[in-house]
Amino acid sequence: MSSKYPRSVRRCLPLWALTLEAALILLFYFFTHYDASLEDQKGLVASYQVGQDLTVMAAIGLGFLTSSFRRHSWSSVAFNLFMLALGVQWAILLDGFLSQFPSGKVVITLFSIRLATMSALSVLISVDAVLGKVNLAQLVVMVLVEVTALGNLRMVISNIFNTDYHMNMMHIYVFAAYFGLSVAWCLPKPLPEGTEDKDQTATIPSLSAMLGALFLWMFWPSFNSALLRSPIERKNAVFNTYYAVAVSVVTAISGSSLAHPQGKISKTYVHSAVLAGGVAVGTSCHLIPSPWLAMVLGLVAGLISVGGAKYLPGCCNRVLGIPHSSIMGYNFSLLGLLGEIIYIVLLVLDTVGAGNGMIGFQVLLSIGELSLAIVIALMSGLLTGLLLNLKIWKAPHEAKYFDDQVFWKFPHLAVGF
């Protein structure tokens, strides 16, 4: 007989998720309306394409990237979709309430959907550190807390530091990474004897994870340029991101081979390292004045990613209980920091070049933004971790970590788990 959700979760999840969905529908009913002023339909189509790219990145890219576990690939893809769908709805409302609410109504535009998709992407990055150890009811909590924390962080940064949409959204890499790592730190860590094989990767899921990485690789320029407000900035962002991810692929594959005693290439290294350039270049993609600089960044990011993938999993597994193949968290934390540092360096160069003698002030502002992003990520991540540990959510037992059969109906399987 195929396995079932524990009875308690069968009661808890549908009730919790459907009640939440009903509440969201009511909020949309009372507080939102569409932007009715679209004079230019051609512009609408072009604008929609960017949003579509972001949705592909989220649903297919990150969905499949996290699906490399031998016995947890179904859950990875479907739970990602579930979180994306829920996250986008809540992010649209939250962004609207934070930025437009004095007017009484939240106007929904393609841009607000774009922003919401990017906010939801944050959860999909973070969740890599905890997938397989939590159920859907817990993931709902994680979505709500993280989207709320990111929305508030972005609002605070834009108000205090006068930062534009692109800059305050590019903190997403660092924010998502530290949020995910701090949630993972709070969850039960040790894997009981006999279940270690479940968090290992298998060939077919690894292939689908590579497919996810390819989708992310293709659409990363769209992500980095989506919130820029002029065509020339967007063009720069697209070009620089493309050069950076191109170089990071070459570096990832070569570096992975170099890091192995027999010169073999690790799938896990490649999955994440191919994206390294896109993350590292994100914050300053519109500012980098020439291709060679973006390419150097891609090279450095690729090397850091491969180095991190080689030496950090041991530490992360011991301290945070994150499996070897879930390297997005520490990868993004390192590369996000690299990206922020590059931005500060460019800021200093600009300040020196303009001769206005305000270097300290400029650097202080940027460090303030980054510190705030990390602090809020850690605090909200710890809060989420503590919430997820509550008995009410009926978390999977450690023996049932990384197992699709706990959550899915497999009619062809005769043996339950």
Partner: antibody, heavy 125, light 107 residues
Framework: EVQLLESGGGVVQPGRSLRLSCAAS????????MHWVRQAPGKGLEWVAV????????EYADSVKGRFTVSRDNSKNTLYLQMNSLRAEDTAVYYC??????????????????WGQGTLVTVSS | AELTQSPSFLSASVGDRVTITCRAS??????LAWYQQKPGKAPKLLIY???TLQSGVPSRFSGSGSGTEFTLTIASLQPDDFATYYC??????????FGPGTKVDIK
Amino acid sequence: EVQLLESGGGVVQPGRSLRLSCAASGFTFSTYGMHWVRQAPGKGLEWVAVIWFDGSNKEYADSVKGRFTVSRDNSKNTLYLQMNSLRAEDTAVYYCAREEVVRGVILWSRKFDYWGQGTLVTVSS
Amino acid sequence: AELTQSPSFLSASVGDRVTITCRASQGIRSYLAWYQQKPGKAPKLLIYAASTLQSGVPSRFSGSGSGTEFTLTIASLQPDDFATYYCQQLNNYPPFTFGPGTKVDIK
């Protein structure tokens, strides 16, 4: 030569609506962000709204949020400002302005480099 | 960021060196522009990025500052320069606030 020409102003009663237009020529309209700025009689300049080059995002001053809507038709090279629920304090000359993005040493800067001649909106009973 | 300008009114003679100050309530890096406006006319851009002269503007106009304090200097006031001057923050996030203006009058 870059030209911005506002129209649609006039006298209107409180609570009524008015739609302003700004016809652009002499540049590639679809690659520039556009703004509305107003100036009440004898007062300073007040920024009202912005619409991004592709129309994907619009932002407003708190004083007009929920009442004014900015839009553009890139095929007609025209910018619009739909003003609903007008109040006496909305009486002003309304200017449209082009936002140009320029490169500094590394960072990008913005400037309102071209302005229309303005159109007067009077809200009075 | 709120902008304040000082002085709000200034009397000067032709040939004088005139300095107008604009202060921002928050740091706005170098994202500040200066405009000149004459009665019944649209504003005219003089300076952007705090210190860059707009093409076609006479070199007697100059701007400086960064962060929270900015100045517009007219090296030698000409008859055509009697007008109202506004600073504007063009930082990345709306609203793109204008200062209250400084009226330069003939002494």
